[in-house]
């Protein structure tokens, strides 16, 4: 059985068949005698009960409210009520793009790695008994595939496979022809297998500081999800109350890798913080990479070539 419509906010395209199915369907069958009502409210209108007489486009079956088709003026809040059970949905009907075979706002994006298995299957379980034929389009050009009931692509992805794939189901209802479109934006990316993690910036950094002031040493890396980045300083991390490792921030890159940043904060810099190594390490199964920071007094800057300084 088709699962119920649990999402409270739904966006659909005008002119397509659409349905809402409430989530206490099994319960409704048990209580056949119980009054079950569907309501709509929008703008000034408060809770108008829906029935087939209210619109020739609306049909009610057991647990389902059907639209044949849904139109812009169907936008609003819908309620199903049965005894003390209520379910609510907010429906937003958007305009169809007349200049394309799909509407951009109703596209599902998928990322597929090159050479990995790539599949698109056109199926629609709710309307399947009514569907006469289904076509699959790539960038709005029809693909010639054998199966015109459930056209399918199954292959290892290539970069040329990138594009917009639209499944269009054609169906008849009460003598009228309708179509339902489902579009996928397929992006083909480089192989996401593990990279060798790399720390960004020079391996040795001399940082000019003043005694009594604070400094933040930022260590950034490009790494894999399970790699780690950490600071090493002194004999035992945590022994110096003026040194703090801030929380690591890790953000996914568009390629599916991770950009990590971890700051070491040294407060009230003292003599003991000068000319010692503060090491930042990134570690992975494939090994480690380390970069070092050395704090030097501003007055001593002249002794070190300018290009090795970081600010």
């Amino acid at each position: 059985a088709e699962s119920c419509t649990s999402r409270p906010h739904i966006t659909v395209v005008e002119g397509e068949p659409f349905y809402l199915k409430h989530c206490s369907c099994s319960l409704a069958h048990e209580i056949e005698t119980t009054t079950k009502s569907w309501y709509k409210s929008s703008g000034s209108q408060e809770h108008v009960e829906l029935n087939p007489r209210s619109s020739s486009r609306i049909a009610l079956h057991d647990c389902v409210l059907e639209f044949w088709p849904v139109e812009l003026n169907d936008t609003g809040s819908y309620f199903f009520q049965m005894k003390n059970y209520t379910q609510k949905w907010k429906l937003n009907v958007i305009r169809r793009n007349k200049h394309s075979c799909f509407t951009e706002r109703q596209v599902t994006s998928k990322i597929v790695e090159v050479k990995k298995f790539f599949q698109i299957t056109c199926e629609n379980s709710y309307y399947q008994t009514l569907v006469n034929s289904t076509s699959l389009y790539k960038n709005c050009k029809k693909l010639l595939l054998e199966n015109n009931k459930n056209p399918t692509i199954k292959k290892n992805a290539e970069f040329e496979d990138q594009g917009y794939y639209s499944c269009v189901h054609f169906l008849h209802h009460n003598g009228k022809l309708f179509n339902i479109t489902k579009t996928f934006n397929i992006t083909i990316v480089e192989d996401r297998s593990n990279i060798v993690p790399v720390l960004l910036g020079p391996k040795l950094n001399h940082v000019a500081v003043e005694l009594g002031k604070n400094v933040r040493l930022n260590c950034s890396a490009l790494l894999n999800e399970e790699d780690v980045i950490y600071w090493m300083f002194g004999e035992e991390n945590g022994s110096d109350p003026n040194i703090h490792e801030e929380k690591e921030m890790r953000i996914m890159t568009p390629e599916g890798k991770w950009h990590a940043s971890k700051v070491l904060r040294i407060e009230n810099i003292g003599e003991s913080n000068l000319n010692v190594l503060y090491n930042c390490t990134v570690a992975s199964t494939g090994g480690t990479d380390t970069k070092s920071f050395i704090l030097v007094r501003k007055a001593d800057m002249a002794d070190i070539p300018g290009h090795v300084f970081t600010r």
């Epitope: 399970e226 790699d227 780690v228 950490y230 703090h244 929380k247 690591e248 890790r250 953000i251």
Partner: antibody, heavy 128, light 107 residues
Framework: QVQLVQSGAEVKKPGASVKVSCKAS????????ISWVRQAPGQGLEWMGW????????NYAQKLQGRVTMTTDTSTSTAYMELRSLRSDDTAVYYC?????????????????????WGQGTTVTVSS | AIQMTQSPSSLSASVGDRVTITCRAS??????LGWFQQKPGKAPKLLIY???SLQSGVPSRFSGSGSGTDFTLTISSLQPEDFATYYC?????????FGQGTKVEIK
């Protein structure tokens, strides 16, 4: 799913040692640190220490320094906490928790790995 | 070590009430503070990190605020499942330290 499973309850005599284990599953063990926290009966939470699973570095609470040792076995994804010279006031429930000060942003909802997953607790009773 | 002082140590409230728990640090800890919920016989559960960030999966009725030395955990509308003990934790430096806890009981 991600979980930490701790060893069973222990009853020890004063002066003895106890070693509690914490087995991780559902995630890459040596990508996250492990903290140990204890709770005496009817009392609050007390942080005992933290170990970086990926390099063995440790930080211990001052009051336990010299009596506590935290170790890991990455081959079995298990962390251990050993407490020596037990006293009656060491009677408590001992918890391990995954603990890495890492905020991960993938999509819309950030997720924080600092003490985000806990073991079920191990009761250690010290009594003569 | 940084001392964390929580208040009140206990409070009685009804379902639907707005509840506020405070935590004070003995020194500036920026925003390096977390809040945990613990129910009897269970392990603690992380609610808030970095003083005001809601951990993924935690209901939005929980919120945290503050920075420096003074922090607050607020439950906007207390639910039956929220009756528990709440702890703050500073993760600014080592040793980590917890507040002594606030028990939220049914009025």
């Amino acid at each position: 799913q991600v979980q930490l499973v701790q060893s069973g309850a222990e009853v020890k005599k004063p002066g003895a040692s106890v070693k509690v284990s914490c087995k991780a599953s559902g995630y890459t063990f040596n990508s996250y640190g492990i903290s140990w926290v204890r709770q005496a009966p009817g009392q609050g939470l007390e942080w005992m220490g933290w170990i970086r699973t990926y390099n063995g570095n440790t930080n211990y609470a001052q009051k336990l320094q010299g009596r506590v040792t935290m170790t890991t076995d990455t081959s079995t994804s298990t962390a251990y906490m050993e407490l020596r010279s037990l006293r009656s006031d060491d009677t408590a429930v001992y918890y391990c928790a995954r603990d890495e000060a890492r905020i991960v942003v993938a999509g819309t909802t950030p997720y924080y790995y600092g003490m985000d997953v806990w073991g079920q607790g191990t009761t250690v009773t010290v009594s003569s | 070590a940084i001392q964390m002082t929580q208040s009140p140590s206990s409070l009685s409230a009804s379902v639907g009430d707005r509840v506020t728990i405070t935590c004070r640090a003995s020194q500036d800890i920026r925003n390096d503070l977390g809040w945990f919920q613990q129910k009897p016989g269970k392990a603690p559960k992380l609610l808030i990190y970095a003083a005001s960030s809601l951990q993924s999966g935690v209901p939005s009725r929980f919120s945290g605020s503050g920075s420096g030395t003074d922090f607050t955990l607020t439950i906007s509308s207390l639910q039956p499942e929220d009756f528990a003990t709440y702890y703050c934790l500073q993760d600014y430096n080592y040793p980590r330290t917890f507040g002594q806890g606030t028990k939220v009981e049914i009025k």
